[in-house]
């Protein structure tokens, strides 16, 4: 009698290897015979595709290589004809070893950076990655993990995090390892010993030393107001990655020296520069004109402090002007990392308008000189306690560096606005800012001896600087 | 790119006033830093300066012509002028209008290419 | 007016080195510039603030100045240097000189 058909085992969870033969099976009782067709994922699987074997008529559907993409719902239909289609599905897992499809290479990073080895898996079940450092399995911290992808990540890279790294992908088919690979951590060149400023008697000799360090170890260079100094008179040493180099001189006139440390990232350098002056005791430079030109302020230290759309003078007695100048704020303007939050940026304001003077619209370049006033409120009441501070040290000879010597107005020597209102210079000023906290206080709210000046907007107008300063 | 450009009388008699024109363009005559120069060149001999005006408009002169030098400007016109007096053969020269700026130590970094002027009767 | 002393003539041979000096009272305290004229054009500006080349000169243009000589260096002289030379400072008063002017001839 003709019977409708019935699956007498329905299909289950198959799971196989790739590479390995995996198998579903349909039993039909029906009479007729039925037709069992093959779906996966609910598309037809057809009797040709030369990667099944359909047996046993249509009963048995074997895949002869499995492969990770044949994963899927697998369905079989029988239908004779007699009543309904019926249908049973299951699921095909693919198994898989542990695989490193996109392991980690060697990486060179800067300190301070973000570094992150690859290490990409497949497999089934998902394996976990883990990470060896040299012998031994790698410790999470605040500043390294294993990121969902299985990379490495670590945060603010230090000099300690270099070595050889490997990662591990495991499951319960087996565990598969990366090659070795090398993280080399750069640092930026850095001036562990600053030379130190010398006054001394004409035809002394000076050594001038200057220490750095970073990874590659640096070379040093020194300049001599500008200009290159021959190797001849300088001995350097390399020592567990810092470099100690002096410099020999025969004084017969003041200079600047800088000594510059460099070192290269790849197609990159970074550069670390510190700068003494050597000075002559009794030395009277025979005066000379205003020689110079004048620029766009190029530098950095004082980018926030000059106005921006003016020139200033560039004074070509230094061989490189802008350097030499940019160098002679730099050296002040960490001595004033130091001072009170009041006389800093009223100092920094000063300093960089004395050093980088505005240049006179005039028919020949010449420099503005800051107007009396504003050098004396500066001096009198912004850092009254740090300038007495400072000119005691200078008269009894204690300051470390006599480059403030060179940075440093006589405010007496200034012109008065009062004379001609256009032969001096003002400090840059802005109209008091509640979000820029680096303010003047008001003029007006204290009663200097110095004839502050009247700022051009109204009387609760303050002085204000805001600077930004990054150098390496 | 500033350029600039002299002209005026090829041609001027003596005891007369010889006047040129100097036209500015791809920059204005009253920007700072900026100043505007009369030099020139007697035939077979070198440069020689006669004076200048500044963005502002204050003119100076070479000491040795100042009694008959005069320059002056025309800024709607962005053009410099120079008068000068009781002309003589000596005064014959090619005439030069150039820039002075003080971004190369107030050199003159720009010039016309200058206007023959004879004085002759 | 302040007094700018060049000697007339130089010669140089193709390649060598040119000097060209100019003489004046501690010159060395003051700003020297140097134009180049060939025949029949306009000065052109090769060096500035004694030393400093504007862009588009080559760097075989160099300056110095010192004491009271400036100096106009030409290193390897080519052909195409061949021309007038001629200093100029400006004085305190806002008056500028020029020096006589040296003719370089390229052997």
């Known amino acids: 009698l003709p019977k409708a058909p019935v699956i007498t085992t329905p299909l289950e969870t198959v799971d196989a290897l790739v590479e390995e033969v995996a198998t579903f099976m349909c039993a039909v009782e029906s009479y007729p015979q039925p037709e069992i067709s093959w779906t996966r994922n609910k598309i037809l699987i057809k009797l040709f595709d030369t990667r099944y074997s359909i047996r046993e008529n249509g009963q048995l559907l074997t895949i002869l290589s499995v492969e990770d993409s044949d994963d899927g719902i697998y369905c079989c239909t029988a239908n004779n004809g007699v009543g309904g289609a019926v249908e049973s599905c299951g699921a095909l897992q693919v198994k898989m070893k542990p695989k490193i499809t996109r392991p980690p290479i060697n990486v060179k990073i800067i300190e301070g950076l973000k570094a992150v080895l690859p290490c990409t898996t497949m497999g089934n079940p998902k394996p976990s990655v883990s990470w060896i450092k040299g012998d031994s399995p790698l410790r999470e911290n605040s500043r390294t993990a294993v990121l969902e992808s299985g990379s490495l990540r670590i945060h603010n890279v230090q000099k300690e995090d270099a070595g050889q790294y490997r990662c591990v992908a495991k499951n319960s088919l087996g565990t598969a390892y990366s090659k070795v690979v090398k993280l080399e951590v750069e640092v930026f060149a850095r001036i562990l010993r600053a030379p130190e400023s010398h006054n001394v008697t004409f035809g002394s000799f000076v050594t001038l030393h200057c220490t750095a360090t970073g990874i590659p170890v640096p070379t040093i260079t020194w300049i001599e107001n500008g200009n290159a100094v021959s190797s001849g008179s300088i001995q350097e040493s390399v020592k567990d990655r810092v470099i100690d180099s002096r410099l020999q001189l025969f004084i017969t006139k003041p200079g600047l020296y800088t000594c510059i440390a460099t070192n290269k990232h790849g197609e990159k350098f970074s550069t670390a520069k510190a700068a003494a002056t050597v000075s002559i005791a009794e030395w009277s430079k025979p005066q000379k004109d205003n020689k110079g030109y004048c620029a766009q302020y190029r530098g950095e230290v004082c980018n926030a402090v000059l106005a921006k759309d003016a020139l200033v003078f560039l004074n070509t007695s230094y061989a490189d002007p802008e350097e030499a100048q940019e160098l002679l704020v730099h050296t002040a303007w960490n001595e004033l990392k130091v001072v009170s939050p009041l006389c800093r940026p009223a100092a920094e304001a000063l300093l960089c308008n004395h050093v980088f003077q505005e240049c006179s619209p005039g028919v020949v370049p010449t420099p503005i000189p800051i107007c009396r006033e504003y050098c004396l409120a500066v001096k009198e009441l912004f850092c009254a306690k740090e300038w007495l501070a400072m000119e005691e040290k200078t008269h009894r000879g204690l300051y470390r560096s006599e480059m403030h010597l060179l940075s440093v107005p006589e405010c007496s020597k200034l012109p008065s606005m009062h004379w001609d209102p256009t032969a001096c210079a003002r400090l840059p000023h802005l109209d008091y800012n509640k979000e820029n906290p680096k303010t003047f206080p008001p003029m007006t709210s204290s009663k200097p001896s110095v004839d502050i000046p009247n700022l051009p907007s109204s009387s609760s107008s303050s002085f204000s600087v805001s600077p930004t300063y990054s150098m390496t | 790119q500033v350029q600039v450009q002299e002209s005026g009388p090829g041609l001027v008699k003596p005891s007369q006033t010889l006047s040129l024109t100097c036209t500015v363009s791809?920059?204005?005559?009253?920007?700072?830093?900026?100043?505007w120069s009369w030099i020139r060149q007697p035939p077979g001999k070198g440069l020689e300066w006669m004076g200048v005006?500044?963005?502002?408009?204050?003119?100076y002169y070479s000491p040795s012509l100042k009694s008959r030098t005069s320059i002056s400007r025309d800024t709607s016109k962005n053009q410099f002028s120079l008068h000068l007096s009781s002309v003589t053969p000596d005064d014959t020269a090619v005439y030069y209008c150039?820039?002075?700026?003080?971004?190369?130590?107030?050199?003159?970094?720009?010039w016309g290419q200058g206007t023959q002027v004879t004085v002759s009767s | 007016s302040y007094e700018l002393t060049q000697s007339p003539s130089v010669s140089v041979a193709l390649r060598q080195t040119a000097k060209i000096t100019c003489g004046g009272n501690?010159?060395?305290?003051?700003?020297v510039q140097w134009y180049q004229q060939k025949p029949g054009q306009a000065p052109m500006l090769v060096i500035y603030?004694?030393?400093r080349r504007p862009s588009g000169i080559p760097e075989r243009f160099t300056g110095s100045n010192s004491g009271n000589t400036a100096t106009l260096t030409i290193t390897g002289a080519q052909a195409e240097d061949e021309a007038d030379y001629y200093c100029?400072?400006?004085?305190?008063?806002?008056?500028?000189?020029f020096g006589g002017g040296t003719h370089l001839t390229v052997l």
């Open positions: 100029h400072v400006w004085g305190s008063t806002a008056s500028a000189d």
């Open positions: 150039a820039r002075g700026s003080s971004r190369v130590a107030a050199a003159f970094d720009s």
């Open positions: 791809g920059g204005s005559i009253t920007a700072r830093y900026y100043s």
């Open positions: 005006i500044a963005y502002d408009g204050s003119t």
């Open positions: 501690r010159i060395g305290g003051k700003s």
């Open positions: 603030a004694d030393s």
